[in-house]
Interface confidence: low
């Protein structure tokens, strides 16, 4: 019995309640598809954002603010960013294939909307994607890296103040709104009620404001999508950039895969892995009869010490092995014994 | 990409000491040993020692113990060799390389010492 | 220590020519052999690794071969911007040792 299913678009689910990329920049878009039998063809179209305006004097419904319709190929991208559409490539998913489209904008020029759209036998899906192109305010985090639960960082929205001015900070609530198949995301900016907004400290330079939100002691419940408004000084139009914040849960070190005890010959050499993880990620040493290895022009450990050749083994080589990954959370080791057969040439090296 | 940033030339009078710096980037510094090699004017290379980052553990060729002593700073991604008791046998370009399991991958510009009354 | 004996210690050669450069190891070092190659005035090269691995970026007229006690680096259609001197290098064990080098000339 094989049931058929019309292409189901991944993103839908995942999608944030604002697209906003800063200008001149590359982006890929991504529409995953889950069909059967798998779509015969993805299609990627679009418009100007202007072209498919929010206007209050439109008769526009609320779970669909965009009411689109001139949609053009992405071949045609004549007024609009240069494109590029990356073959299709297969991945298994959640335990589904999936067939996956992505489309590449050289450089973020004009705000648009992208639309892909996946046929198969039984049906069509799409995914509208707003592509709200700003030239400022900006988002950086700092230190520029996820941190993990327990760690400080800030986040920094820079804006130019000979253009923008009344710089805030805000985070998404947790219950993004309801998105409805084939509708955008309502724009940010047009939804102030849906965010909290949070206290930051305000610096200047010569030619920037700067808001700096800082988060001390992060918790997975700092997790989310934060936003920086700033208004245009001149039309007081407010421009929005989101950062999706994640922090990384502190997991103590564990070892993946076995070191198995083995046996070898004098003269052969021996290589074994040892992968840790954890967070922070745990540093490997390796122990040899209880004590630390030293890495010789034998003994060679690479990859951050995940990685252990011994090269040209001796009779003294044999012994038991352990590889021990730590971090400020504690340690996991895993053990092997090796074995070395044969007799011993005699050497007159160091 | 990598790169090995050594310290200035050194002119020294005999008997002095004089410490070679070699600050690393473009790779992690802890993962790979940091070599040492002696290039006397218009002679072959001469290797001196190795020490690994990682855990300060070093090894030096017979004739340089006493005379060579390298240590690493982690924390600004930079190795030190230390040469004492200078004579006129240790005037030579002193080159710092990152050690690539038994070769040495890449290399730093060199640091000419000059030992002179 | 392991002795490492180069030959020839200077050559001439042509524009196009192919030359070997030979490496003698006084004992097994099996194929932990390295070749450098260091123009005047410049800082060594690493060329080829653990005998016959070229290193990133070396142009592939360059190649390594041998295993033991004997090496050979083979340039083959010699460019102007191969003239200098060439090292070989041990990493079978410490203290590391270099060959005393080959100078590569122009005829």
């Known amino acids: 019995l094989v049931v058929y299913v019309p292409p189901q678009i991944g993103e839908k689910s995942l999608i944030s309640p604002v697209d906003s990329y800063q200008y001149g920049t590359t982006q890929t878009l991504t529409c995953t598809v889950y069909a059967i039998p798998p779509p015969h063809h993805i299609h990627w179209y679009w418009q100007l954002e202007e072209e498919c305006a929010n206007e209050p004097s439109q008769a526009v419904s609320v779970t669909n603010p965009y009411p689109c319709e001139e949609w053009r190929s992405v071949e045609d991208f004549q007024g609009g960013n240069k494109i590029e559409v990356n073959k299709n490539q297969f991945a298994l998913i959640e335990g589904k294939n999936k067939t996956v489209s992505t489309l590449v904008i050289q450089a973020a020029n004009v705000s648009a909307l992208y639309k892909c759209e996946a046929v198969n036998k039984v049906g069509r899906g799409e995914r509208v994607i707003s592509f709200h192109v700003t030239r400022g305010p900006e988002i950086t985090l700092q230190p520029d890296m996820q941190p993990t639960e327990q760690e400080s960082v800030s986040l920094w929205c820079t804006a130019d103040r000979s253009t923008f001015e009344n710089l805030t900070w805000y985070k998404l609530g947790p219950q993004p709104l309801p998105i409805h198949v084939g509708e955008l995301p309502t724009p940010v900016c047009k939804n102030l009620d849906t965010l909290w907004k949070l206290n930051a400290t305000m610096f200047s330079n010569s030619t920037n404001d700067i808001l700096i939100m800082e988060l001390k002691n992060a918790s997975l419940q700092d997790q989310g999508d934060y936003v920086c408004l700033a208004q245009d000084r001149k039309t007081k139009k407010r421009h929005c950039v989101v950062r999706q914040l994640t922090v990384l849960e502190r997991v103590a070190p564990t070892i993946t895969g076995n070191l198995e005890n083995q046996t070898t010959s004098i003269g052969e050499s021996i290589e074994v892995s040892c992968t840790a993880s954890g967070n922070p990620p745990p540093q490997i040493m390796w122990f040899k009869d209880n004590e630390t290895l030293v890495e010789d022009s034998g003994i060679v450990l690479k990859d951050g010490n995940r990685n252990l050749t011994i090269r040209r083994v001796r009779k003294e080589d044999e012994g038991l092995y352990t590889c021990q990954a730590c971090s400020v959370l504690g340690c996991a080791k895993v053990e092997a014994f090796f074995i070395i057969e044969g007799a011993q040439e005699k050497t007159n090296l160091e | 990409q990598v790169q090995l940033q050594q310290s200035g030339p050194e002119l020294v009078k005999p008997g002095a000491s004089v410490k070679v710096s070699c600050k690393a980037s473009?790779?992690?510094?802890?993962?790979?040993?940091m070599y040492w090699v002696k290039q006397s004017h218009g002679k072959s290379l001469e290797w001196i020692g190795y020490?690994?980052?990682?855990?300060?553990?070093?090894s030096y060729k017979q004739k340089f113990k006493g005379k060579a002593t390298l240590t690493v700073d982690k924390s600004s991604s930079t190795a030190f060799m230390h040469l004492n008791s200078l004579t006129s046998e240790d005037s030579a370009v002193y080159y710092c390389?990152?050690?690539?399991?038994?070769?040495?991958?890449?290399w730093g510009q060199g640091t000419s010492v000059t030992v002179s009354s | 220590d392991i002795q490492m004996i180069q030959s020839p210690s200077s050559l001439s050669a042509s524009l196009g020519d192919t030359i070997t450069i030979t490496c003698h190891a006084s004992?097994?070092?099996?194929?932990?052999l390295s070749w450098y190659q260091q123009k005047p005035g410049n800082i060594p090269k690493l060329l080829i690794y653990?005998?016959?691995n070229l290193h990133t970026g070396v142009p592939s007229r360059f190649s390594g071969s041998g295993s033991g006690t004997g090496f050979t680096l083979t340039i083959s259609s010699l460019q102007p911007e191969d003239i200098a001197t060439y090292y070989c290098?041990?990493?079978?064990?410490?203290?590391?040792?270099f060959g005393a080098g080959t100078k590569l000339e122009l005829k």
């Open positions: 390389a990152k050690g690539y399991a038994d070769a040495m991958d890449y």
């Open positions: 473009g790779y992690s510094f802890t993962d790979y040993s």
């Open positions: 020490i690994d980052p990682y855990n300060d553990d070093t």
């Open positions: 004992q097994n070092i099996n194929v932990w």
């Open positions: 653990k005998a016959s």
């Open positions: 290098q041990q990493g079978q064990s410490y203290p590391l040792t």
